[in-house]
């Protein structure tokens, strides 16, 4: 029983450096505890952006200093990443793990390419 994870192919961050996307998984079991990890892949380097473990029916709780926030609804997780700049453009991959009860299942999405464009500085206004 493989666990399929779906996420959008492309997302454009807002001018304020905020990007949101949905990570949806087809659960092969009746999990009560799920861990979601966002991984960024750029230039063959992989970094963990953020991770949260949540009980089904409860909210995701990321660490206080995390750049991610999120909400869950059934087998769907709505993820928001903030504080993004142009240099953060890359492939953001959703990894889902069904932690409890056993058996454990792993699912990895194909990734969401997030494009971040730094806003142009406002020209000085003469009054």
């Amino acid at each position: 029983k493989a666990m399929h994870v779906a996420q959008p192919a492309v997302v454009l961050a807002s001018s304020r450096g905020i990007a949101s996307f949905v990570c949806e998984y087809a659960s092969p079991g009746k999990a009560t505890e799920v861990r979601v990890t966002v991984l960024r892949q750029a230039d063959s380097q992989v970094t963990e952006v953020c991770a949260a473990t949540y009980m089904m029916g409860n909210e995701l709780t990321f660490l206080d200093d995390s750049i991610c926030t999120g909400t869950s609804s059934g087998n769907q997780v709505n993820l928001t990443i903030q504080g993004l700049r142009a240099m953060d453009t890359g492939l953001y991959i959703c990894k889902v793990e069904l932690m409890y009860p056993p058996p454990y299942y792993l699912g990895i999405g194909n990734g969401t390419q997030i494009y971040v464009i730094d806003p142009e500085p406002c020209p000085d206004s003469d009054f």
């Epitope: 493989a2 666990m3 861990r35 992989v46 990895i108």
Partner: antibody, heavy 119, light 106 residues
Framework: QVQLVESGGGVVQPGRSLRLSCAAS????????MHWVRQAPGKGLEWVAV????????HYADSVEGRFTLSRDNSKNTLYLQMNSLRAEDTAVYYC????????????WGQGTLVTVSS | EIVLTQSPGTLSLSPGERATLSCRAS?????LAWYQQKPGQAPRLLIY???SRATGIPDRFSGSGSGTDFTLTISRLEPEDFAVYYC?????????FGQGTKVEIK
Amino acid sequence: QVQLVESGGGVVQPGRSLRLSCAASGFTLSNYGMHWVRQAPGKGLEWVAVIWYDGRNKHYADSVEGRFTLSRDNSKNTLYLQMNSLRAEDTAVYYCARGGVWGSYFDYWGQGTLVTVSS
Amino acid sequence: EIVLTQSPGTLSLSPGERATLSCRASQSVSYLAWYQQKPGQAPRLLIYGASSRATGIPDRFSGSGSGTDFTLTISRLEPEDFAVYYCQQYGSSPWTFGQGTKVEIK
């Protein structure tokens, strides 16, 4: 650099207990799934147990469920495998291994510690 | 539990030859890894995700396959490649290994 060092192996009689340790350096245990894999003499690899991230969730192979217990000391960055009611078939080299970023393949292994259960 | 069956049990080849190792799963597998183990040593990760080479692994090692059939190929055997090779699935617990294929010098 990442390093895993096991200790605590030895010869023990059937029914007795033993505690194995795995000292980790070069990374933080709580960021990874940490596994024990064993190998009986001249045999293949067998997964034994895993302790996940925050340490609350643990999974065990059916062959050791109820007899083996995993724990972790974050302050020492050390993993423990408490083995009770040992049997002759538990005789093996026990390896501590780190799960990878993309899942529970094992990207780093310790050198192993030999446990011999014999009367 | 997913059972992995490796074939052949032993492969007798000469340095410079191509080695093809097979791993067949009892049911569809999403995530598969390959390891190399030499006598008296811990296993070493070669391939994860069926085809991604681990850090520092020479490009003569390649992995392929999906579903129930996977292959590890060593394009040109070097003297240090003679060892036992294991496949492992990690998509669901319990994590399982194949019984191993020994690549020996002919």
